[in-house]
Interface confidence: medium
């Protein structure tokens, strides 16, 4: 099953009746799978086999960095248990698998190149154009994204991370709404209070009035 | 104090249905989201459906889209979970858990006793 | 090889102080996802022990004593669960599981069984 149809309605609300933060988005790494045999936004943490060193960028918390390869990245719970298929297939919209092979020596070029076709060098990727934010062997570098009509671009790609973008003011996106900005809430259900504002990367925040939680 | 029970499960053989019931209370039920997890014997744990505090968004692990529906009756601070055309595979104990639905926090943190399902010819 | 890593089994004597470890897949960055620790006592439902996200962010389970603590290792993409003063009812089965802090995703090791020595 693909993982757009994880959910059977379209996320419109928070999950509980407070909402909780986005966690921040890396830069380099994949997010842990949202569907058995798929990963979210990471196009080169996609294909596990040739994803090398941590990138040390990471997106600042409640940024969306676009991806070549794009995915709902829907809330769900996924077993791993001995024996069970978590292995990431390689849904490639826009490279050949080919690209993700090893070198014969099994090196890679490291974040801000890609692997030539013909040379078998390192080439640096065009600052503005593309990026490569991990270790890799792709015969070209990612393309840079342009933000949406419904986001503020928050820093521009440079050849190690693709462009970073923001909900404009006023609305936000958190996991249930991964491909759009959503309006802020204007006030909390009954018997909340709130304790945060909204902010790009999440709706107001509200708690129960009552304040025995205990563990939060 | 925060109670789950789960009722309903049983024997049942393969390609027949049962519905799972969970009972709430100790909490106020229409603020949390719920969910269904499950346990085959001597195995993990394994995630199998969610649904948010009004019952407008619902969730579901790959292995039962299609075959199992989650729901909730919040008059009645109860959850469901509508299971057909079973398979072996789908023998475990079934939990009923909370979401914990608080600022920051996205854990299960209460869980019921269980009801056992069993698919068998 | 699967996303989380959990070892199958450790042991530590009564008193004693253990650390659980839960080793996240190289492709994934540990910081930037919340680390959840449970416990499964035999023939008992999972109970909430722990999240842990940072020093500054992380959250007890209902009546877990703090002898349960949660940290991290962002540069061995790792998490912790330590166990102080163990006691014979720490001996269970302990599921970490990671996610995001705003979503239900979570994703389950595969356990550890920790049993606790006389």
């Known amino acids: 099953a693909s993982g757009t149809e994880a959910a059977t309605a379209t996320p419109s609300k928070v999950w509980g009746s407070s909402a909780g933060r986005i966690e921040p988005r890396g830069g380099g790494r994949g997010a842990l799978p949202t569907s058995m045999g798929q990963q979210g936004p990471s196009a080169q943490a996609r294909a596990g086999r040739v994803v090398g060193p941590r990138s040390a960028q990471g997106a600042s918390p409640g940024l969306r960095v676009h991806k070549t390869l794009k995915f709902v990245v829907v809330g769900v719970l996924l077993q791993v248990v001995p024996g069970s298929a978590a292995t990431i297939k390689v849904h490639d919209q826009s490279v050949g698998t080919q690209q993700w092979e090893h070198s014969p020596l099994g090196e890679l070029c490291p974040p801000g190149s890609h692997r030539s076709e013909h040379s078998g060098a390192c080439n640096q990727c065009t600052e503005g154009v593309g990026y490569t934010s991990a270790s890799n062997n792709l015969f070209s570098c990612l393309p840079c994204t342009a933000c949406k009509s419904d986001e503020e671009e928050r820093s521009a790609c440079t050849r190690t991370r693709n462009t970073a973008c923001q909900c404009k003011p006023g609305t936000f996106r958190n996991d249930d709404s991964a491909e759009m900005c959503r309006k802020c809430s204007t006030g909390c259900p009954r018997g909340k209070v709130k304790v945060k504002d909204c902010t790009p990367w999440s709706d107001i925040e509200c708690v129960h009035n009552e304040s025995g939680n205990g563990h939060n | 104090e925060v109670q789950l029970v789960e009722s309903g499960g049983g024997l049942v053989k393969p390609g027949g249905s049962l519905r799972l019931s969970c009972a709430a209370s100790?909490?106020?039920?229409?603020?949390?989201?719920m969910h269904w997890v499950r346990q085959a014997p001597g195995k993990g744990l394994e995630w199998v459906a969610g649904?948010?505090?009004?019952?407008?968004?619902?969730y579901y692990a790959d292995s039962v889209k299609g075959r199992f529906t989650i729901s909730r009756d919040n008059a009645k601070n109860s959850l469901y979970l509508q299971m057909n055309s079973l398979r072996a595979e789908d023998t475990a104990v079934y939990y009923c858990?909370?979401?914990?639905?608080?600022?920051?926090?996205?854990?299960?943190?209460?869980w019921g006793q269980g009801t056992l399902v069993t698919v068998s010819s | 090889q699967p996303v989380l890593h959990q070892p199958p089994a450790m042991s530590s004597a009564l008193g004693t102080t253990i650390r659980l470890t839960c080793t996240l897949r190289?492709?994934?960055?540990?910081?930037?996802?919340?680390v959840y620790w449970y416990q499964q006592r035999p023939g008992h439902p999972p109970r909430f022990l722990l999240r842990?996200?940072?020093?500054?962010?992380?959250?007890?389970g209902p009546q877990v004593p703090p002898r349960f603590s949660g940290s991290k290792d962002v540069a061995r993409n790792r998490g912790y669960l330590s166990i102080s003063e163990l006691q014979p009812e720490d001996e269970a089965m302990y599921y970490c599981?990671?996610?995001?802090?705003?979503?239900?995703?979570?994703?389950f090791g595969s356990g550890t069984q920790l049993t606790v020595l006389s």
């Open positions: 100790g909490f106020t039920f229409s603020t949390y989201g």
């Open positions: 190289n492709d994934h960055d540990i910081g930037v996802y919340s």
């Open positions: 842990y996200f940072s020093q500054s962010d992380k959250s007890q």
């Open positions: 649904i948010n505090y009004s019952g407008n968004n619902k």
């Open positions: 599981a990671m996610g995001a802090r705003s979503s239900v995703t979570h994703v």
């Open positions: 858990a909370r979401d914990s639905s608080t600022t920051r926090t996205r854990a299960l943190d209460y």
